[in-house]
Structures are given as structure tokens and as C-alpha cells.
């Protein structure tokens, strides 16, 4: 059974990676660039399904892609601290909460979506978790 | 210029295993955001997608075919592969390399391969 | 798997005819549309990604427009290199699918 110290390391990872995620969106829907265009038209996929802290194992599969759009949209108008070590950090996180354990085999839904889709996503999936921990 | 260029057995026997790679040239398969496709056309039909790769090995195939097929990169060597098990002659069809950028139009293709599903 | 229904299946024009092609996506595809120009013998060749963006070096003639369900494809003014079979493709949704194509044949 989780401990209190587990639920709350648990609570403040979620936290640690809703803020990653809101900083990346924040900086996409504040971004005045040519390049904008483009990168919507990148699909992202979405879990069929993500209610539990091992369906994040979807997210991890998509980070790679959301790596390549952020370092598209690099510019004077839109600077996120180095993409690769916050991608890499997402990751950390990411691989800690789902867990090790068991592998899933990630359930994508039929449809697509934008990368402002994805991150607002995986943002409710985030809130929607850490209020259930508190 | 990226180019694509497809190789691979033109004649398969039925239940047999259908391989094929595609070579890329003038560019990197690692490049950023770029995914590697398999299509196909049946004789005077339409296209169907068949699968992707990304550099980093992730792959996504149409669930109609999912169960025969396999797709795997070799960044190496800068080429990527299909593997079609248990071909029919329904599979008898020109087979397609493709890039697209972000799972989106196929905005690179090979000059395609003649594939025959015949004993 | 979304179905593409283009129209016509085949159509004859002449030179400096205007040509409109539609597609219809059995489901929105928001405007996540592409049309390809296949000549025989040869691989596709993508003319308008998202509905009404013009692939590089993709002449000024052909044009896109449509969102949800329902888009065209117009050859302003149809040049004898324009004779082909033309196909829209959605990428909204997985698999990707393509329509049937239609084929533009000289009068």
C-alpha cells in the first residue's frame, strides 16, 4: 500500500511535470512566429485512455516527437531553456511515476491532435491525478 | 535532396515473407521529425498506408495489416525495412517508400517496386 | 478507418479548362487534407498539404480549399503536364487513408 511520504513524492513529481508542461504550452500559445502554422500541423497521438499513473507510458512515447516541434520552434519570440535537457527531465519523471514494472502497450486513440491539444492533454491528466493524491 | 530508393525481391511465394528496404540519400534518416513510410497500390487501385518508423525505432502500422507487418531502421546504414509475412496475392501490389514530417502529407516518395505474390 | 469519396472518378477536360475535384471524408477531418498528382508509372507527388497550403514548387494553378468534411481541389487552368489521377489523403486520423482518385483524361 502507498505511504503518506510515497503519495506525496508522487504529488509533488505530478507537479514538478504539470508546471514542464504548462511552461511548454504557455510558451506555444504566446509564440508570434512564421512557424507556428507548421508546427500545428504535427500530429500528435493520444491515449485511447489515461486514468492511471502507467498509462504515462503514452506520453513517454510521444516525447521524442514533442523534442523535434519545440526545437522547430526555437527563435527570438519563442525561448524554452534548453529543449533537450526539459524533454530529458519530463522523461525522468515520467519513467519514475509510471514505474518499471510492467510494460504497457500504449492505446492510442483513433484521433490526432496539435501539439496545444496534446499538452492541454496530458495538463488534465496531471490535475486530474494529483486530485485524487490530495 | 533527400531521395528514397526502394530494393527488395520483385517476385514472392505465396505464405513466404516479403522484404523489402528503403534506402535514403541526401539526407539523414535521423532528421527531426521526420517519419519513414510504407505504401502500396495494387494494380490500378488506390494507395493504402501501410506503416511508419522513426528514427528512434517507434513504429505505427494500419491495424489491418498489423499482424504481418514489421518495420525496423538501421540509422547506420541510413536505410529502413518492411517485412510482410504470410503474403497472399492480394498483396501483389507497387510498394512505396515514403517521409513525411509530423504524421502528415508524404512529402518525399522512392520511385516505388513491383511486388508479385505468385508460386 | 475514415473513408475518402472523391468525385468525379474520372472527368475530360481541355487545355485552359478550369477543373474542380472534390473530397469527402466520412468523418471532420478538421482541415488535415493533402492532395497528391500520381502520372503513370510514377510515385505520387503532394501539391496542397492542410487543406490550402501549397507545397514548394507546386505551380500557383492548382489551389485547395475545404475544412470538416468536404474539400476541392482546382486546376485553375489546366496545362497538358496536369493530365493525371489525383488523390486527397486524410492524416487526422489513424490509419491514414486515401480516396479512390480521380482521373483527368484530355477531351
Known amino acids: 500500500a502507498p505511504t503518506s511520504s510515497s503519495t506525496k513524492k508522487t504529488q509533488l513529481q505530478l507537479e514538478h511535470l504539470l508546471l514542464d508542461l504548462q511552461m511548454i504550452l504557455n510558451g506555444i500559445n504566446n509564440y508570434k512566429n512564421p512557424k507556428l502554422t507548421r508546427m500545428l500541423t504535427f500530429k500528435f497521438y493520444m491515449p485511447k485512455k489515461a486514468t492511471e499513473l502507467r498509462h504515462l507510458q503514452c506520453l513517454e512515447e510521444e516525447l521524442k516527437p514533442l523534442e523535434e516541434v519545440l526545437n522547430l520552434a526555437q527563435s527570438k519570440s519563442f525561448h524554452l531553456r534548453d529543449t533537450k535537457d526539459l524533454i530529458s527531465n519530463i522523461n525522468v519523471i515520467v519513467l519514475e511515476l509510471k514505474g518499471s514494472e510492467t510494460t504497457l502497450m500504449c492505446e492510442y486513440a483513433d484521433e490526432t491532435a496539435t501539439i496545444v491539444e496534446f499538452l492541454n492533454r496530458w495538463i488534465t491528466f496531471c490535475q486530474s491525478i494529483i486530485s485524487t493524491l490530495t | 535532396q533527400v531521395q528514397l530508393q526502394e530494393s527488395g525481391p520483385g517476385l514472392v511465394k505465396p505464405s513466404q515473407t516479403l522484404s523489402l528496404t528503403c534506402t535514403v540519400s541526401g539526407g539523414s534518416i535521423s532528421s527531426g521529425g521526420y517519419y519513414w513510410n510504407w505504401i502500396r497500390q495494387h494494380p490500378g487501385k488506390g494507395l493504402e498506408w501501410i506503416g511508419y518508423?522513426?528514427?528512434?525505432?517507434?513504429?505505427h502500422y494500419n491495424p489491418s495489416l498489423k499482424s504481418r507487418v514489421t518495420i525496423s531502421v538501421d540509422t547506420s546504414k541510413n536505410q529502413f525495412s518492411l517485412k510482410l509475412s504470410s503474403v497472399i496475392a492480394a498483396d501483389t501490389a507497387v510498394y512505396y517508400c515514403a517521409r513525411d514530417w509530423g504524421r502528415d502529407a508524404f512529402d518525399i516518395w522512392g520511385q516505388g517496386t513491383m511486388v508479385t505474390v505468385s508460386s | 478507418d475514415i473513408q475518402m469519396t472523391q468525385s468525379p472518378s474520372s472527368l475530360s477536360a481541355s487545355v485552359g479548362d478550369r477543373v474542380t475535384i472534390t473530397c469527402r471524408a466520412s468523418?471532420?477531418?478538421?482541415?488535415?487534407l493533402n492532395w497528391y498528382q500520381q502520372k503513370p508509372g510514377k510515385a505520387p507527388k503532394v501539391l496542397i498539404y492542410a487543406a490550402s497550403s501549397f507545397q514548394s514548387g507546386v505551380p500557383s494553378r492548382f489551389s485547395g480549399s475545404g475544412s470538416g468534411t468536404d474539400f476541392t481541389l482546382t486546376i485553375s487552368s489546366l496545362q497538358p503536364e496536369d493530365f493525371a489521377t489525383y488523390y486527397c489523403?486524410?492524416?487526422?486520423?489513424?490509419?491514414?487513408?486515401f480516396g479512390q482518385g480521380t482521373k483527368v483524361e484530355i477531351k
Open positions: 489523403q486524410q492524416s487526422h486520423y489513424i490509419p491514414r487513408t
Open positions: 468523418q471532420t477531418i478538421s482541415s488535415y
Open positions: 518508423i522513426y528514427y528512434s525505432g517507434n513504429t
